[in-house]
Structures are given as C-alpha cells and as structure tokens.
Amino acid sequence: IWELKKDVYVVELDWYPDAPGEMVVLTCDTPEEDGITWTLDQSGEVLGSGKTLTIQVKEFGDAGQYTCHKGGEALSHSLLLLHKKEDGIWSTDVLKDQKEPKNKTFLRCEAKNYSGRFTCWWLTTISTDLTFSVKSSRGSSNPQGVTCGAVTLSAERVRGDNKEYEYSVECQEDSACPAAEERLPIEVMVDAIHKLKYENYTSSFFIRDIIKPDPPKNLQLKPLKNSRQVEVSWEYPDTWSTPHSYFSLTFCIQVQGKSKREKKDRIFTDKTSATVICRKNASFSVQAQDRYYSSSWSEWASVPCS
Amino acid sequence: VPGGSSPAWAQCQQLSQKLCTLAWSAHPLVGHMDLREEGDEETTNDVPHIQCGDGCDPQGLRDNSQFCLQRIRQGLIFYEKLLGSDIFTGEPSLLPDSPVGQLHASLLGLSQLLQPEGHHWETQQIPSPSPSQPWQRLLLRFKILRSLQAFVAVAARVFAHGAATLSP
C-alpha cells in the first residue's frame, strides 16, 4: 500500500481467483483513543472499533472510503483504491491501446516545434467517475522540471456502438534548450482513477522523435504565361521554430487528380516554391518535415488547381 | 578553423546534410523494434552530445562559432572511431555497399574539413570493451546510429545556419 495523495491510498493486488489479498491497517487521524468506530462508504454498518482497523483487501468491495467516527462525528477518512496486477502485468482497463506506432501505446504525444512544449492525448470508452492527473520530467534519476496544464476532454467520437473520449494535456519543459541535442528523454506519467480502480500509464520520448510540424501555410498558385505550368509557393507554418535558416524544413509536394486512383507524382524539395503542371479539377498539396531528422510529416495543406 | 578562421560553411552544410541522409538510411525509423532498443538513461551517456552550453545555438554561433565547431569535430571523430571499431566490423558483417561504410567516410571527411592537417584538438576516448555476442553488437549498433542521427541533425542545422548567415 502507498499514499497517492493525502488520505488516498493505493493497494496493489495480485489479481487471480482466490488470491489472499493484502492486509491493510488503517489508523484514525485523531488524538482520541476511545469510542471510535469505522464505516465504509455510505453504509452505516460498523466494521470495527478502536483507533486502528485491520482489513483484508481482496476485491473492489473492500475498497472505498473508510471513515472513523466518534459520537456521530467523522474524525478522518481514508480512500482505498485498487491497482490490479494480473500475471505480473499491471492492468490497463481504463485507456484504449492506440496501437500506433506500436502495440501497448496508451499515450501519444506530439510537438509542433523544438520549444519544449508538447501535447499528449489518450482514449477511453469510460464516460463517468473518471479522473486523470499528469506528471512529467526530463530524465528520471535526476529529473528536470516539466510543467503540465490541466487535463481536458478534447474530443468525443462515436465508434460503432461505443462512444470514445479523447483527453489531452499540454506540457512545457521549464528550461528548454531547442538547439541542443537531447540526452535524456522526457517522461510522462498519467494516473487514471475510475471509480475505485487505479492505473498508471507512462511514456518516454525525446522531443525530436515526436516533432510533427503544422502544415505549410499561405499556399499560392501563379499560372505561368503561355504554359500549362503553374508556380506554386508556400511558407513555413507560424508555429515552427525560428530562425528558419537553423530550424529548416523539407517539403513533399504532389498534384492529385480528381480520381483518387490517378497516379500522383511526389516531389521533394527544400525550397518554398516549385513549378508544376496543375490540371483543372486537380489539387496541389504540400507537407513539411524537419529537414535533418526524420520525425513525422505534417498533415497536407491543399489548394485547388483551378 | 583552429585559431578562429571560418570553416567552408557551404561545403560543411552539404556534407552534414549527406550525413543525415546516410544515418537514416542505415537505420530507418520503424514502428516497432525487433530487438529492444530502449535501455536505461545511461546507455548513450558515454557518447558526446551537443549540449546547451556548447554555443551551437544561433546566438552562440554569432558570438563565437569556435566552441561549437570544436564540439562537433570531437563528436565526428568519436563516431568515426565507433563506426570503424569491431562493434561494426564484427558479425553480422557489413556488406560491401553498406551505408555504414559511406557514413564512416563522410564523418572523416567532415572532421577533416573542420581541421586541416597539422592541427589537433582533444578528442574523447572511445569506450571499450565491445560486446562479444552478435545480438549485443546489433543492439549497440542501433543505439549508436540512433544517437548519431540526433548528433548530425544538430550539426547540419549549425552548418546550414552558418552557410546562410556567417559565410563571408
């Protein structure tokens, strides 16, 4: 058993049929010695008396808010949550496996630039009695500070018969150094509590590996005189790190016909303009990636040819 | 470069960008690792990193690029030695057209651009001993190539910025 926060305790249980469970001793936080009784949750049933209460925690029915009373007045509370371990593996019932980029990916994180700011998100099908808290640091043995904001419900989607909820959090490294080569990874730890179930999820990454630029902005087409060719231009997204002479992007451009089956030629360039043949009904698209490190490509930015 | 002269920024830019391409072709990003790559924090602490105080940011380069160039050169020589060591020459053997061979040559080429013959800067000692099992060797190769990718990305940014803003 360990303390998650004041008056909230997590009991770690090996979860299998007829498991013996954990013996837990609760102590009433009071100078009083006599006339103390204990109850669980809203039930008025007295579980025991005295300054301490010894219980055997085996299942969710044994978890909950234990209260010690004297003379009808509550003296202190202890909330017991359960953390299940099945076959040596901690349970992951609350969050959905996003399976990208690999199996057992429960937290996904992205950064738009090298400023040390990043966003993490996760999915669940649970809609009520659910709370999250997030901690983050750079490195774990000698951690450096990362500050995370409040967790927000960022999206709701219907997937077949189920509703899926996306939660996200924004974090900022306290002393980011955008130009340096990261030596220690960022660690993100999410505590999830659903009713009386406690779970924790972690992710470890370098900012450089989670970079995903915003799409290029300000796409423009300029037809060339007496030619089927068009000069296309675009700009770095506003959110990308500066100066651009240092934090450079590379671009992938393509012209897509009306039919998705039509062959599309992709051209790679470090420039912010190109000359292409842009037929009527087609569209021109461009995406960006860090020029020197193969992190994610941005989403496509598109503009119709006509 | 030693003693404060400027490097051939444009040449360094070209070669460092080539290094980035080679480093990624030698170890592309894949969704899952077939051998567990992630070790504890200490695994790549013995390779040189370009750190915050090394003057490799745009402001530091403007003030005095020498600190940063020395750091980059130390790293290049360190990785060049690693790529020539039995970590890479042992089983499983590199084939004649291995990108590691090209990487090795390019690391040497860029380090020489930064230090013409006759000047010698301090370089870090290469760690030893190297692993005896092929699977340990593979793991170490992947770690080295991953950290090399991060190192040459910073070096390439430095040379791109230098070529754009510091060239005479």
Epitope: - | D97, W135, L138
Partner: nanobody
Framework: EVQLVESGGGLVQPGGSLRLSCAAS????????MGWYRQVPGKQRELVAT???????DYADSVKGRFTMSRDYDKRTVFLEMDSVKPEDAAVYYC???????????????WGQGTRVTVSS
C-alpha cells in the same frame, strides 16, 4: 551477394512429416526478419511463418500447431518442420530474409530459389 538456399522438399504422404532447411551465405543475425512462404501455380505467394531477430515465430492460421519454424545460428540455417501434412500444403516453399538496413544499401529483401513439396498418398 547474399544467398538463401532451400532444401528438404520432396514427396510426403498426408499426415506425414517433412523438414525444410534454408541455408544463408551470411550470419542469420544479418536478417531482421526471416520467413517461409509458399506458392501454388496460379496463386499469390502466401506467408507460412516468420521470425524476427530475438523474437519467436509467428504462423499463418492454416499451419498453426502443425508447422514449427526454428533456426540454428551456428549453422546459419533456418528450418521449417512440417507435421500432420495436408494435401493443401503442397506448394513450392520459399525462404525469405530481410537484411538490416545498415548492412547494405541495396536489395534488403533476399529470396531463395524455392523447394517443391508434393503431398500424395
């Protein structure tokens, strides 16, 4: 040039067993993934079993529980143990290896020439 050479094919009765071998010209640590595929004339080549470096084998549903893929690092060889063979297992069996990217700039995918398995009573 890296080569894979299969052997061990031949005639087998339904319910019988056969052991296919695939010998590599380089250490099998050189391969990120090795696999056995099979092809029947007029049909696409289908995956039978694969094994990643340091991993355990994965099998196609049709052969699970009957076929076993293994490797011998010292002999630079991978094997396909075929038990409880069925008529539908008759095909040309190919060995495949995908080389680690750092070992070569070209031809990451290496194929053997194939070995024929005939199932007949």
């Amino acid at each position: 040039e890296v080569q894979l050479v299969e052997s061990g094919g031949g005639l087998v009765q339904p319910g019988g067993s056969l052991r296919l071998s695939c010998a590599a010209s380089v250490s099998i640590w050189s391969f990120k993934v090795m696999g056995w595929y099979r092809q029947v004339p007029g049909k696409q080549r289908e995956l039978v079993a694969t094994i990643t470096t340091g991993g355990s084998p994965d099998y196609a549903d049709s052969v699970k529980g009957r076929f076993t893929m293994s490797r011998d690092y010292d002999k630079r060889t991978v094997f396909l143990e075929m038990d409880s063979v069925k008529p539908e297992d008759a095909a040309v069996y190919y060995c495949n290896g995908r080389l680690w990217a750092h070992l070569t700039s070209s031809g990451h995918d290496v194929w053997g020439q194939g070995t024929r398995v005939t199932v007949s009573s």
